[in-house]
Interface confidence: low
């Protein structure tokens, strides 16, 4: 009689995570008498998956009824597959012995590959806010996928980005893989409403990629521009000076008025107006009683935005003993102040 052969017809089996894997094995003879065992891996460190003779293997079921005397089908099913189950499985025939059964013959092995979906991409931006024209880095991470082949793309507002670096780890064989990508994004003043999107495509996703997003509103800081102007005289001895704070983001802003260097009033931006690009505008005004001042009045609008050092604009009101015609209203210059003859 021909010697028993253990046949594993499938060199490889591909299964999606969560599904059931069927590992096929048949023997060509009933002799010698003895049990079948399944192992993952070969050699001394192999892991027992199923023992026909004894043990409890809750995830494993047999395809055939192994209690029937003439059964030669030793195929098994392993339920709820995870990437950790990947590996080469061997169907091994043992010969009954005393005191222990003796390994008789092994099948050639079946490689189980697990298709595991990548986790939802997580996009994270820089720890500190940055201002327009700066290059900031965003990272995208996704884990637990298999096989290793994966495609990652970056978009900003639907436009694909090209400046990024991607690594898939580990480099060698593994039960599952992780992807890590870093994209460089140059901020613009219009980016308050912008989004950065990381898109991951994988064979397990059947053409429906996963996306992770980050809002640039959490990354960008747009510093304000200040403009101090003098409004027409409301009363004979009163002047209304306004400070226009424009195009800033985020909203956190505190404004302080100083008269000749002394704090006159401090207020926090509350009822701001929002621009189409997501930045904010705000206006504060100061009513100055000119008759209370003997000398020229230096008015300063000082703004602290989002915890940054204060920026300021100044404006000089010239208190004159000789009445002159009221000057025209123009914005304060960057470098200094506009003089006004107030009477």
């Amino acid at each position: 009689e021909e010697e028993l052969q253990v046949i594993q017809p499938d060199k490889s089996v591909l299964v999606a995570a969560g599904e059931t894997a069927t590992l096929r094995c048949t023997a060509t003879s009933l002799i010698p008498v003895g049990p079948i065992q399944w192992f993952r891996g070969a050699g001394p460190g192999r892991e027992l998956i199923y023992n026909q003779k004894e043990g409890h293997f809750p995830r494993v079921t047999t395809v055939s009824d192994l209690t029937k005397r003439n059964n030669m089908d030793f195929s098994i099913r392993i339920g709820n597959i995870t990437p950790a189950d990947a590996g080469t499985y061997y169907c091994v025939k043992f010969r009954k012995g005393s005191p222990d059964d003796v390994e008789f013959k092994s099948g050639a092995g079946t490689e189980l590959s697990v298709r595991a979906k990548p986790s939802a991409p997580v996009v994270s931006g820089p720890a500190a806010r940055a201002t327009p024209q700066h290059t900031v880095s965003f990272t995208c991470e996704s884990h637990g996928f298999s096989p290793r082949d994966i495609t990652l793309k970056w978009f900003k507002n639907g436009n694909e980005l090209s400046d990024f670096q991607t690594n898939v780890d580990p480099v060698g064989e593994s039960v599952s893989y992780s992807i890590h990508s870093t994209a460089k994004v140059v901020l613009t003043r219009e980016d308050v409403h912008s989004q950065v999107i990381c898109e991951v495509a994988h064979v397990t996703l059947q053409g429906d990629p996963l996306r992770g997003t980050a809002n640039l509103s959490e990354t960008i800081r747009v510093p304000p521009t200040l403009e101090v102007t003098q409004q027409p005289v409301r009363a004979e001895n009163q002047v209304n000076v306004t400070c226009q704070v424009r195009k800033f983001y985020p909203q956190r802003l505190q404004l302080t008025w100083l008269e000749n260097g002394n704090v006159s009033r401090t207020e926090t931006a509350s009822t701001v107006t929002e621009n189409k690009d997501g930045t904010y505008n705000w206006m504060s005004w100061l009513l100055v009683n000119v008759s209370a001042h003997r000398d020229d009045v230096k008015l300063t609008c000082q703004v602290e935005h989002d915890g940054q050092p204060a920026v300021s604009k100044s404006h000089d009101l010239k208190v004159s003993a000789h009445p002159k015609e009221q000057g025209s209203n123009t914005a304060a210059e960057n470098t200094g102040s506009n003089e006004r003859n107030i009477y």
Partner: antibody, heavy 127, light 105 residues
Framework: AVTLDESGGGLQTPGGALSLVCKAS????????MGWVRQAPGKGLEFVAA???????EYGAAVQGRATISRDNGQSTVRLQLNNLRAEDTGIYFC?????????????????????WGHGTEVIVSS | AVTQPASVSANPGETVKITCSGS????YGWYQQKSPGSAPVTLI????KRPSNIPSRFSGSKSGSTATLTITGVQADDEAVYYC???????????FGAGTTLTVL
């Protein structure tokens, strides 16, 4: 004392790539911004790149798109990778330590807050 | 752009002011280079902060968009090129001025 030691300079070929490394000591490296400044022969100082807390980076106009700055806080090193080298990249490259770890004035200004410099490493791009 | 004068001169003992105009919101740094290619020395950073090893003769200030490096009691050893650094007011990118050569007569 703060020391910054640059390496990686030398003769480079046009179109090639350059990798400069700055090894820092004498301070808590991870707590400070770091940068690179260069000086072409007979010219003034030119900002090349800076890397800030949170790993946001800034690049000078002349190297934008060709340069990558990175840091290894464990090794206390900052690296400048410059691709597609040109003759005008010739010069002395200085490693610079920033006085702070964040940004001020609403902008991260890598040229307004340098408090320590390396001795420089010379790069010559020539065929 | 960041603009500074190409050259200034002074007699020993005099006070020299070197100006640098750029960003009104930014901070400024001042760096001394005694010979081309030698490592610069930081005199002032963040507009008015002086490293502990720099003499108090050097001070920094700012008014509006103009920063000033003041050297009181100029010495012959102060002959050098002085660079200011800040950010460009329109692009927000970090830049240096072209440098100011100080000649001590």
């Amino acid at each position: 004392a703060v020391t910054l030691d640059e390496s990686g300079g030398g003769l480079q070929t046009p179109g090639g790539a350059l990798s400069l490394v700055c090894k820092a000591s004498g301070f808590t490296f991870s707590s400070f911004n770091m940068g690179w400044v260069r000086q072409a022969p007979g010219k003034g100082l030119e900002f090349v790149a800076a890397i800030y807390s949170g790993n946001s980076a800034e690049y000078g106009a002349a190297v934008q798109g060709r340069a990558t700055i990175s840091r290894d806080n464990g090794q206390s090193t900052v690296r400048l990778q410059l691709n597609n080298l040109r003759a005008e990249d010739t010069g002395i490259y200085f490693c610079a330590k920033d006085a702070g770890s964040g940004c001020y004035s609403g902008v991260c200004a890598g040229t307004s807050s340098i408090d320590a410099w390396g001795h420089g490493t010379e790069v010559i791009v020539s065929s | 752009a960041v603009t500074q004068p190409a050259s200034v001169s002074a007699n020993p003992g005099e006070t020299v002011k070197i100006t640098c105009s750029g960003s009104s919101s930014g901070s400024y740094g001042w760096y001394q280079q005694k010979s081309p290619g030698s490592a610069p020395v930081t005199l002032i950073y963040e507009t008015n902060k002086r490293p502990s090893n720099i003499p108090s003769r050097f001070s920094g200030s700012k008014s509006g968009s103009t920063a000033t490096l003041t050297i009181t009691g100029v010495q012959a050893d102060d002959e050098a090129v002085y660079y200011c650094g800040s950010e460009d007011s329109s692009t927000y990118l970090s830049i240096f001025g072209a440098g100011t050569t100080l000649t001590v007569l």
